[in-house]
């Protein structure tokens, strides 16, 4: 997995008038890292993990950069011509990556009302846009503004590729995120499903990186995909991830089933707990 830094900026307009507030979220290696969500932006680390990466310092630099970015995006939204009445949003997502071979990738994507209309490869400076006429119109609009305003808005649009990578390298220097491996905690629970059946759920939490294999096996053989229900792999707010898998089995056959977990080259199997069936909310409807 490459190391990545992802900026997600959102600004709003109401009845054609651009709102003063904006929302900025920054993800480092796929984890929520920084956030600005008030009229007056104050960069807030998302959890202890982010504080550890940033070290013992104020976040003035991040706050300044994110505030500048927000202002620039508000100006861009103001230049979009087809502002109909009601609420509209302009979103910019900027991502830069450093791969294991030290190669880099950077891109920028614009969304209007949640719909992608313009992308740029920040290394080749190549622009791409969807085929729809609405997207094309928006894209031309925004590209023209960015060209015109390139000098004025250099805080945001000048050397974005370099700036993003510079920040990413700075964060990586902390050592906190560098190729760390945190093994998951695995927990198996059971709940009554229907007459003679129980639902068994296997939860893995607190692991990093996010790639994990979690599945149910019967006597050592994987159950087919369509007999299992998987949860998404989600950040748990501590710089680590969580997920789950569930299946329905016959009561009395619990000892035949194990939850198989594989993460970062390590694996383990986890039996279904025996004893009294706990009545829990089932994942299966």
């Amino acid at each position: 997995e490459p190391h990545s830094l992802r900026y997600n900026l959102t600004v709003l307009s109401w009845d054609g008038s651009v709102q003063s507030g904006f929302l900025t979220e920054v993800h480092l290696d796929g984890q929520p890292f920084l956030r600005c969500d008030r009229q007056k932006c104050r960069a807030k680390p998302q959890g202890q993990w982010a504080e550890d990466v940033l070290g013992n310092k104020t976040w003035d630099r991040e706050t300044r950069d994110l505030t500048g970015n927000g202002k620039d995006l508000r100006m861009t939204l103001a230049h979009i011509k087809d502002q109909k009445e009601g609420l509209h949003s302009l979103q910019e997502i900027r991502v830069c990556e450093i791969h294991e071979d030290n190669s880099t990738r950077s891109s920028q994507h614009f969304y209007y009302d949640g719909e992608l209309f313009l992308s740029q490869n920040l290394e080749t400076k190549e622009w791409t846009m969807p085929q729809s006429s609405r997207a094309q119109t928006l894209a031309m609009n925004v590209r023209n503004f960015l060209k015109e305003d390139a000098m004025k808005t250099k805080t945001h649009y000048h050397a974005m590729h370099a700036d993003c990578l510079q920040e990413l390298r700075r964060y990586l220097k902390s050592g906190v995120v560098l190729r760390r491996t945190v093994p998951p905690m695995v927990n198996v629970t059971r709940s009554e499903a229907s007459e003679g059946n129980i639902t068994v759920t296997c939860r893995a939490s607190g692991f990093y990186p996010w790639n994990i294999t979690l599945s149910w096996r019967q006597d050592g053989v994987s159950l087919s995909h369509d007999t299992q229900q998987w949860g998404d792999v989600l950040p748990d707010g501590n710089g680590t991830y969580q997920t789950w898998v569930a299946t329905r089995i016959c009561q009395g056959e619990e000892q035949r089933f194990t939850c198989y977990m594989e993460h970062s080259g390590n694996h383990s199997t986890h039996p279904v707990p025996s004893g009294k069936v706990l009545v829990l909310q089932s994942h299966w409807q």
């Epitope: 050592g220 053989v221 016959c250």
Partner: antibody
Framework: QVQLQESGGGLVQLGGSMKLSCGAS????????MNWVRQAPGKGLEWISY????????YYADSVKGRFTISRDNARNSLYLQMNSLRAEDTALYYC???????????????WGQGTMVTVSS | DIQLTQSPSSLSASVGDRVTITCRAS??????LNWYQQKPGKAPKLLIY???SLQSGVPSRFSGSGSGTDFTLTISSLQPEDFATYYC????????FGGGTKVDIK
């Protein structure tokens, strides 16, 4: 005692069909996953199909996918293999085999039948 | 699909010899590996499951080891009844057998 007995083998024409059966006795058949494994004359073992106890997980080897169908009838303690579009290379001794239920098992086959011979002729 | 490669494909040994058969998987299968013995005209018999666990009723001269991609079946002191063909089998991803190793009398 615990036993598996295959039947239904014999001579069949190229492109023809045949259905094999495997009768189980001496254990609770409905609790066990089952397999079909074949062995061509003078060759090694080839796993061809798996079905779990509830028939909701079924796997096939690529060599038989789309032509063979595994099924079971827990009330009759029986396992079946429907073979269609038979080819010369399907000529083999066909075994049914039970997946062990021992704790910590890794899909091992602990009980095997004696096999039934299928010969596909042109 | 995962391929299992057994080596050697055949070997000659004498009663009392220590015999080692290897099975290599095309990718890591952790410990999802089993070993079988088959004598001519007979059905296969399970010897070892989970790479190293001895099946009930199997003599202790048989042992299994390995994890990941490389596995070994060892017969510490070959007995007359051990001349047979040995197969490895994995269940990590679907199911497959190795090509077999025939152990005959030197």
């Amino acid at each position: 005692q615990v036993q598996l007995q295959e039947s239904g083998g014999g001579l069949v024409q190229l492109g023809g069909s045949m259905k094999l059966s495997c009768g189980a006795s001496g254990f609770t058949f409905s609790s066990y996953s089952m397999n079909w494994v074949r062995q061509a004359p003078g060759k090694g073992l080839e796993w061809i199909s798996y079905i779990n106890s509830r028939s909701n997980t079924i796997y096939y080897a690529d060599s038989v996918k789309g032509r063979f169908t595994i099924s079971r009838d827990n009330a009759r303690n029986s396992l079946y293999l429907q073979m269609n579009s038979l080819r010369a290379e399907d000529t083999a001794l066909y075994y049914c085999a039970r997946v062990s239920s021992v704790t910590g098992n890794t899909g091992a086959f602990d009980i095997w039948g004696q096999g039934t011979m299928v010969t596909v002729s042109s | 699909d995962i391929q299992l490669t057994q080596s050697p494909s055949s070997l000659s040994a004498s009663v009392g010899d220590r015999v080692t058969i290897t099975c290599r998987a095309s990718q890591s299968i952790h410990n999802y590996l089993n070993w079988y013995q088959q004598k001519p005209g007979k059905a296969p018999k399970l010897l070892i499951y989970a790479a190293s666990s001895l099946q009930s009723g199997v003599p202790s001269r048989f042992s299994g080891s390995g994890s990941g991609t490389d596995f070994t079946l060892t017969i510490s002191s070959l007995q007359p009844e051990d001349f047979a063909t040995y197969y490895c089998q994995q269940s990590y991803s679907i199911l497959t057998f190795g090509g077999g190793t025939k152990v005959d009398i030197k």
